[in-house]
Interface confidence: medium
């Protein structure tokens, strides 16, 4: 009679995480008498997965009725597969005795587990940066298998090329992680921009996962200031406005100085929003010219988003001609932003 053979027909089996894996095993003879055991791995460190004779294996069920005397099918099903279950499984025939001794092993079936990557998480720099600066964004995704994965970066739908990606670990593992860093140059129009990290993997079957970062959380657009003198509103009164344009975020404090002395401080509240997401704001100061004997230097000083203050000044000329004072005429001087009050 021919010697018993242990046949594992599948060299490899690939299963999605969470599914059940069926590992096939048949023997060609009922002799010698003795149990079948399943192991993961070979050698002294091998792990017992199933013992036909004894033990409790809650995730393992036999495919056929292995308790029947004439049964020669010892295939098993392992439920709720995770990446940690990956490995080579051996169906081993034992000869009955005290103790049972190993008689013959199957060739082994390699179980690979397909696991989806986690949703990519994109994080930007800790501090805001201004236009023309280059900032770094990182993208991370974990827990996928097999190792082969594709990662792309986009800014507003346009693919980026300046990035570096690593998949860890380098060697064999039950699951893998990907880490990528992209460099993005900021522009003044980036308040509404998005940076997207896209991960594609065999388990996703054409539905890539995306992680997003809004550049509104990264960018700081400093304001431009313009100080102008409005037509005289009333006798001896001049209205000076400070236009604060194209700034982001909204956090802004403005201080008016008259000849270096603080006149008024206010916080931007009723701002107008531009199409590009930046803000405009206007503050005005009513100056009583008759209260000043000499020229007045008016300064609009703006502190934006905790940054060092920027300022713009305007010289208000107060003429020493009493007989003409209060005639409510404003003549423009050749100097920029200057007015002579007569």
């Amino acid at each position: 009679e021919e010697e018993l053979q242990v046949i594992q027909p599948d060299k490899s089996v690939s299963v999605a995480a969470g599914e059940s894996a069926i590992l096939h095993c048949t023997v060609t003879s009922l002799i010698p008498v003795g149990p079948i055991q399943w192991f993961r791995g070979a050698g002294p460190a091998r792990e017992l997965i199933y013992n036909q004779k004894e033990g409790h294996f809650p995730r393992v069920t036999t495919v056929s009725e292995s308790t029947k005397r004439e049964n020669m099918d010892f295939s098993i099903s392992i439920s709720n597969i995770t990446p940690a279950d990956a490995g080579t499984y051996y169906c081993v025939k034992f000869r009955k005795g005290s103790p049972d001794t190993e008689f013959k092993s199957g060739a082994g079936t390699e179980l690979s587990v397909r696991a989806k990557p986690s949703a990519p998480v994109v994080s930007g720099p800790a501090a805001r940066a201004t236009p023309q600066h280059t900032v770094s964004f990182t993208c991370e995704s974990h827990g996928f298998s097999p190792r082969d994965i594709t990662l792309k970066w986009f800014k507003n739908g346009n693919e980026l090329s300046d990035f570096q990606t690593n998949v860890d670990p380098v060697g064999e593992s039950v699951s893998y992680s990907i880490h990528s860093t992209a460099k993005v140059v900021l522009t003044r129009e980036d308040v509404h921009s998005q940076v997207i990290c896209e991960v594609a993997h065999v388990t996703l079957q054409g539905d890539p996962l995306r992680g997003t970062a809004n550049l509104s959380e990264t960018i700081r657009v400093p304001p431009t200031l313009e100080v102008t003198q409005q037509p005289v509103r009333a006798e001896n009164q001049v209205n000076v406005t400070c236009q604060v344009r194209k700034f982001y975020p909204q956090r802004l404090q403005l201080t008016w100085l008259e000849n270096g002395n603080v006149s008024r401080t206010e916080t931007a509240s009723t701002v107008t929003e531009n199409k590009d997401g930046t803000y405009n704001w206007m503050s005005w100061l009513l100056v009583n010219v008759s209260a000043h004997r000499d020229d007045v230097k008016l300064t609009c000083q703006v502190e934006h988003d905790g940054q060092p203050a920027v300022s713009k000044s305007h010289d208000l000329k107060v003429s020493a001609h009493p007989k003409e004072q209060g005639s409510n005429t404003a003549a423009e001087n050749t100097g920029s932003n200057e007015r002579n009050i007569y």
Epitope: T150, L204, Q205, G206, D207
Partner: nanobody, 126 residues
């Protein structure tokens, strides 16, 4: 290996409609990106439409855009190709295929698809 079966082909007049179905004998088609391809006599096989596993991503070849619609019912594990305004040049054997390995959805290269059905004949003629 996924075993795909197409149905719904036949003879139709120009301007008519047909709906092709693709099912999997092992009921696993809901796990894979799926495409419809066609091959006319003497011509190379070409991609017609493809759909991602969830159905949220679809792609079409230019000649069928606006006339053909690919969809899927994952509860029934079936993928459909609704063909309207059919033209004589749509005459071909239509194949359903599953993409088991690609990262991105692609209809252009049939080499990305590694599980095929036997095909169903579509003839557009008056």
């Amino acid at each position: 290996q996924v075993q795909l079966v197409e149905s719904g082909g036949g003879l139709v007049q120009p301007g008519g409609s047909l709906r092709l179905s693709c099912a999997d004998s092992e009921f696993r088609l809901d796990e894979y990106a799926t495409g419809w391809f066609r091959q006319a006599p003497g011509k190379e096989r070409e991609g017609v439409a493809c759909i991602s596993r969830s159905g949220s991503n679809t792609k079409y070849t230019d000649s069928v855009k606006g006339r053909f619609t690919i969809s899927r019912d994952n509860a029934k594990k079936t993928v459909y190709l609704q063909m309207n305004s059919l033209k004589p040049e749509d005459t071909a054997v239509y194949y359903c295929a599953a993409d088991l390995t690609s990262h991105y959805l692609s209809c252009s290269s049939y080499t990305d698809y590694n599980s095929w059905g036997q095909g169903t004949q579509v003839t557009v003629s008056s």
